[in-house]
Amino acid sequence: KSSNEATNITPKHNMKAFLDELKAENIKKFLYNFTQIPHLAGTEQNFQLAKQIQSQWKEFGLDSVELAHYDVLLSYPNKTHPNYISIINEDGNEIFNTSLFEPPPPGYENVSDIVPPFSAFSPQGMPEGDLVYVNYARTEDFFKLERDMKINCSGKIVIARYGKVFRGNKVKNAQLAGAKGVILYSDPADYFAPGVKSYPDGWNLPGGGVQRGNILNLNGAGDPLTPGYPANEYAYRRGIAEAVGLPSIPVHPIGYYDAQKLLEKMGGSAPPDSSWRGSLKVPYNVGPGFTGNFSTQKVKMHIHSTNEVTRIYNVIGTLRGAVEPDRYVILGGHRDSWVFGGIDPQSGAAVVHEIVRSFGTLKKEGWRPRRTILFASWDAEEFGLLGSTEWAEENSRLLQERGVAYINADSSIEGNYTLRVDCTPLMYSLVHNLTKELKSPDEGFEGKSLYESWTKKSPSPEFSGMPRISKLGSGNDFEVFFQRLGIASGRARYTKNWETNKFSGYPLYHSVYETYELVEKFYDPMFKYHLTVAQVRGGMVFELANSIVLPFDCRDYAVVLRKYADKIYSISMKHPQEMKTYSVSFDSLFSAVKNFTEIASKFSERLQDFDKSNPIVLRMMNDQLMFLERAFIDPLGLPDRPFYRHVIYAPSSHNKYAGESFPGIYDALFDIESKVDPSKAWGEVKRQIYVAAFTVQAAAETLSEVA
């Protein structure tokens, strides 16, 4: 059967019917419904929301909707013993304490179960000592402190500003520097855009607002107690001492009012340069310790949070494919929030809900997709991508054989300026073609395509007339599908103007002020950007599930492989003498990339010419496309990161949010000049070039004629 036989509607009309059914007013209504109370992972409220979504997806017309539960390690503050930080005098008296909770937003004063700001998975402890200001706590910040300024963080409590990199990397860096505690704070330089009022009068962060978040270094492991396997009823759990990725020192987040009180007394070294200064009226001295008059005062942390094995619930909906039911296209986004989740995640969950409703409407009219579509509402994303990872671990054998694509659906907006897409190169042409067919919601682009406004506002740095598409990193639920299983993945959302807004993320991220009103009043009153994101995400899912030939272009992978090979070669060539001494050659990698390019080109020619009415040949060609992403997976994983198995892309070792290309080679080269054993270090570079070259060549061969 062709997909047209399965549908009774022409393919063009299918897509139009699906897109026309998506309504901004519905997304608005769903967002309101999902944001009236907190939905923290592991709580009764989030279980009830899971059951509501299950019920509604069934009403919308999905074939089946099931809850998948797991018992995973979560972390909560102690309700009777709050976390806080003090300045103590020489007698040990607390002369200043940080806040115990955020001032609630208007209209939410009587809402119960708002979790106070905390760093999830922080160990308990009450360390006291001198403070050292470490800027963003990036790898380069600690290099500056330790190597250039000769400042020792050992035994100190460090204070770092949020932004630039994932908070878990900051904590890892502080631990490695010997710190005994970490204070994270939001500096107005990063979380207060000039000319905008703070919430509730605008979308900026008030001084009492605080960013929550986990501080794990899981490297794709999922539940810290069951790495590699689902946290099911018969799971064997590690002891807490063997758990994956837990921090070893207490950590706590604060807002900028509290940070002002800690930083204004700082003495010691002056900041090394202006890039270490934020926007508070403080000197940004590095320390260690307080200045003259206050030198006998210390900082003390009081952290009493507990780690608890808790049940979480994913909602998994199925719309069975008419022709290839054993091929899965997955649309997934999380449901759990830190508090109200006005943007993260419910702006995404509301879009997923409307996409499900639209697909359900078509199904009720007799239509089915060619391939099966799976819809997922993930739990415990905020605690380390746990729900998605456990489900993927439980279903890994099915997914690696049947998974066509995964489209992520967390926050639909982080701004209202232009589109932002991160995806596998296989999806570049799909995204380009789709956005050319969609209308731009942007002011000044009436009657123009989304492709046009996106390209104008966010041009590709390499190719003129094309929009920027970024590499996938991590920090969201696509991680297990892409980085571990090698399933082609993508994500799309509306974003800010990165050139004019230099703050990190959006100001109210993970704070109590991320409410429905934030979105409705300040970001997207007409919900037109939400609708556009629904059209992009839904349109991608539709095409991936319904096109006769999978909408993947392997030639785009060839282009980026060459670019990434050039880039990593340039990095290595910063050490020409050592490359000569240790006979380091990239010839094998460039040769493999050349072979890949030629084979991909020939495959694409065959793809144009083959007989699409022959179901066996069609399935064969589609399988070659589907399995291409899988071919970049190394079963042994990256060094010390067994669950990051993609050889072309991995989350940066220095920032989980960012993607790194040829990560094995990149990490082997990183800071190589400081390695104690250069011979061993350059040997590892050579090994990583070998692994990369082999993998690219092996992937190329999957596109060759089968016999």
Partner: nanobody, 123 residues
Framework: EVQLVESGGGVVQPGRSLRLSCAAS????????MHWVRQAPGKGLEWVAF????????YYADSVKGRFTISRDNSKNTLYLQMNSLRDEDTALYYC????????????????WGQGTMVTVSS
Amino acid sequence: EVQLVESGGGVVQPGRSLRLSCAASGFPLISYGMHWVRQAPGKGLEWVAFMTYDGSNRYYADSVKGRFTISRDNSKNTLYLQMNSLRDEDTALYYCARDRIVGGRVPDAFDIWGQGTMVTVSS
């Protein structure tokens, strides 16, 4: 309408105790730091005490430190001042006032005042 209403004042002997209350209406007490301020007959205003919105910090004037305790019950939208070991010089009209900065961590300026409650310490 936003308002603060003080109560609990009266005549008391030196060395005795008194508890003042301040009922807030028209705004959520939970988001604001709150002050007690007093004005002795024929004198200027004197700041007495401040408590942050969340109760994490309390600040007192040296003249009342160790004798007065500021507290709050956010669920009742009420601020209190427990005054022990009262002295003649504590005689004053006591006002509660709202700090102008939502979520402020230290005493700042006041933006809303009550009408005051009179405390007279006399033997």
